[in-house]
């Protein structure tokens, strides 16, 4: 069976301030089991944007219904974009682990740029 791939189809997305940004991400497999997370930036200082498992992320909504058992679409929409949201966003698949989940595979990243709000 082919190993899971994380596909972020857009290398970049440009959004006007105040609008919503949709960041697309798809998996090619449901295995290994484990959560999806979105981060802004890479490395130790990356910022958690969304965690499928837990947490409250009021500006983030998932595009697909993640409670579907066969769901492979982990795209998100971030509302009320501001210039501070600019950066590269990574969709990351974790595989289950005990006590901590283990990062399994990351998408290539999508760079979000923020345009000035039209006057």
């Amino acid at each position: 069976e082919d190993e899971l791939q994380v596909i972020q189809p857009e290398k970049s997305v440009s959004v006007a301030a105040g609008e919503s940004a949709t960041l697309r991400c798809a998996m090619t497999s449901l295995i290994p089991v484990g959560p999806i997370m979105w981060f802004r930036g890479a490395g130790a200082g990356r910022e958690l944007i969304y965690n499928q498992k837990e947490g409250h992320f009021p500006r983030v909504t998932t595009v697909s219904e993640l409670t579907k058992r066969n769901n492979l679409d982990f795209s998100i929409s971030i509302s009320n974009i501001t210039p501070a949201d600019a950066g590269t966003y990574y969709c990351v698949k974790f595989r289950k682990g005990s006590p901590d989940d283990v990062e399994f595979k990351s998408g290539a990243g999508t760079e979000l740029s923020v345009r000035a709000k039209p006057s």
């Epitope: 295995i31 290994p32 089991v33 498992k53 409670t67 579907k68 058992r69 595989r95 289950k96 006590p99």
Partner: antibody, heavy 118, light 107 residues
């Protein structure tokens, strides 16, 4: 507090049908997948069916496919199980359960007893 | 199918381990459910292999390794007497499966 309250059980004859209900409160019902699990007298727990939060996707154990139907009405915070062509083997306590993000269970109802007897 | 022992027994204060085998490690999440009497509502003691609900005492813990999961009760109490069911969710089949249950007797 999360509460799940089943109803609709009772004594029926073989071949008859029932609609079981589960009233949910204490959480945002429309955000959670739900399942039905049963326990026959003297037996263990048996998962029957699950449904996604929006209700568009349903999943069944092979032995009840085509005979049981899981559904939900998010406007009423209610989960349902339509059980048709009942047999004595369907005699059990039927529980509804809230699913975790990965389709296990965190909260359970008290159950409703279905007895199939001629 | 998930396999667990039919029964285990322990004295108060001892550590009890109940195993559940038969799932694939990379495709299955495990949970553990306590039922104190037949027909009574099950209580979730562990989900997602090792996650304990906030209202469950810390003496209950869970782990998973290889194709098996383990429920550990450290310092078992008389009130822990119950049947413990393991369950798995398999990401390949979208199906939940329960083990047959393990009766814990506290002597």
């Amino acid at each position: 507090d999360v509460q799940l309250v089943e109803s609709g059980g009772g004594v029926v004859r073989p071949g008859e049908s029932l609609r079981l209900s589960c009233a949910a409160s204490g959480f945002t019902f429309s955000s959670y997948a739900m399942s039905w699990v049963r326990q026959a007298p003297g037996k263990g727990l048996e998962w029957l069916a699950g449904i996604s939060a929006g209700g568009s996707d349903t999943y069944y154990i092979d032995s009840v496919k085509g005979r049981f139907t899981i559904s939900r009405d998010n406007s009423k915070n209610s989960l349902y199980l339509q059980v048709n062509s009942l047999t004595a083997e369907d005699t059990a306590v039927y529980y509804c359960a809230r699913e975790t993000w990965n389709h296990l269970f965190d909260y359970w109802g008290l159950g409703t007893l279905v007895t199939v007897s001629s | 199918a998930l396999t667990q022992p039919a029964s285990v027994s322990a004295n108060p204060g001892e550590t009890v381990k109940i195993t559940c085998s038969g799932g694939g490690y990379y495709s299955t999440y495990y949970g553990w459910y306590q039922q104190k009497s037949p027909g009574s509502a099950p209580v979730t003691v562990i989900h997602s292999d090792d996650k304990r609900p906030s209202d469950i005492p810390s003496r209950f813990s869970g782990s998973a390794s290889g194709s098996a999961a383990t429920l550990t009760i450290t310092g078992v109490r008389v009130e822990d007497e119950a049947v413990y069911y393991c369950a798995g969710y398999d990401g390949r089949t979208y199906i939940n499966t329960f083990g047959a249950g393990t009766t814990l007797t506290v002597l």
